[in-house]
Amino acid sequence: SEVEYRAEVGQNAYLPCFYTPAAPGNLVPVCWGKGACPVFECGNVVLRTDERDVNYWTSRYWLNGDFRKGDVSLTIENVTLADSGIYCCRIQIPGIMNDEKFNLKLVIKPAKVTPAPTRQRDFTAAFPRMLTTRGHGPAETQTLGSLPDINLTQISTLANELRDSRLANDLRDSGATIRIG
């Protein structure tokens, strides 16, 4: 079942997805699509990376993190109710049926009417018991080569479900880890 994330109309929504490159520079193509992950590729692609750059995107969708180190979390700017639904983050690991697929459910709530102005919360989420992948820190040197055979090792799952949307930023440190290589 999908992990659920929430944002209010007019906010930016944050959908986390991470992977660990096998070696510095061995980046893996990633696609984000609206709708559950199909057997191959992403349906209704909103953003795509190749082995080096973001090479396709539609307006309001971007990668705010360090995607070259595996943080391929999607930011959706200024969301509306129409942005509700399932999103697919697909790590396109070379080889037959090697892709890692993550379905994330985005729930958009109407903007709260508050009597006094409050600080806007950009990123909101709930239930971060999810299988994401985590990037690693910067490397001093680089050796780019062919991607090796890839093993996926799931490391550590997370504890408590965070139901309070104000803890969304903590979500960046949550989830399981997928290492490639």
Epitope: N55, W62, T75, L144
Partner: antibody, heavy 120, light 107 residues
């Protein structure tokens, strides 16, 4: 030390093609991308595309797609950029530049530039 | 394509003074902005990458800051050898794009 040495200046007629070479030394050629950037007289910088010598993968600026081809010869550590159907507004200095993961694929070493003049 | 807009187009500053050059992206590019220096008749040189990382051998009077859509190159104390044109570049998406350049002169 890292060096990128480009071929000499070219004068071409409209409709012709030009092939610029860039010989790399001082590093492992296949470990880095080679980007190509041009600069028209008195103008700014414009990215044409890149090639990854390790596997021959390329990415071209859509503006030049169909007119530009980038290749490499690993045996001589040389990159090539061919631009076809030349027009007068292709008159520019063409640079090759190395880019790699360590600097987030920014261009840390540049060739000296090759002046291409397109004139009838 | 992402449009990078620099300001100002040119500026004249006294030696020893602080210099600030701005660059605005037409959409968020995270931290994926680089700065280059190009002196007359020379190839560009990389100064800053990933918004704030100084490239090897670049004097520490050069610094970069910003994220999202707004970025700044700062020269803390202008030296005579800093006279050049400065370009920002987004290295987030393909095609990579550059600002139009800022020409820096001595007042």
């Amino acid at each position: 030390q890292v060096q990128l040495v480009q071929s000499g200046a070219e004068v071409k007629k409209p409709g012709a093609s030009v092939k610029v070479s860039c010989k790399a030394s001082g590093y492992t050629f296949t470990d880095y991308y080679m980007d190509w950037v041009r600069q028209a007289p008195g103008q700014g910088l414009e990215w044409l595309g890149y090639i990854y010598p390790n596997n021959g993968g390329t990415s071209y600026n859509q503006k030049f797609k169909g007119r530009v081809t980038m290749t490499t010869d690993k045996s001589t550590s040389t990159a090539y950029m061919e631009l076809r159907s030349l027009r007068s507004d292709d008159t520019a200095v063409y640079y090759c530049a190395r880019s790699g993961y360590g600097n987030y694929y920014t261009m840390d070493y540049w060739g000296q530039g090759t002046t291409v003049t397109v004139s009838s | 394509d992402i449009v990078m807009t620099q300001s100002p187009d040119s500026l004249a500053v006294s030696l020893g003074e602080r210099v600030t050059i701005n660059c605005k992206a037409s959409q968020s590019v995270g931290n994926n902005v680089a700065w280059y220096q190009q002196k007359p008749g020379q190839s560009p040189k990389l100064l800053i990458y990933y918004a704030s990382n100084r490239y090897t051998g670049v004097p520490d009077r050069f610094s970069g800051s910003g994220s999202g859509t707004d970025f700044t190159l700062t020269i803390s104390s202008l030296q005579a050898e800093d006279v050049a044109v400065y370009y920002c570049q987004q290295h987030y998406s393909s095609p990579s794009t550059f600002g139009q350049g800022t020409k820096l002169e001595i007042k």
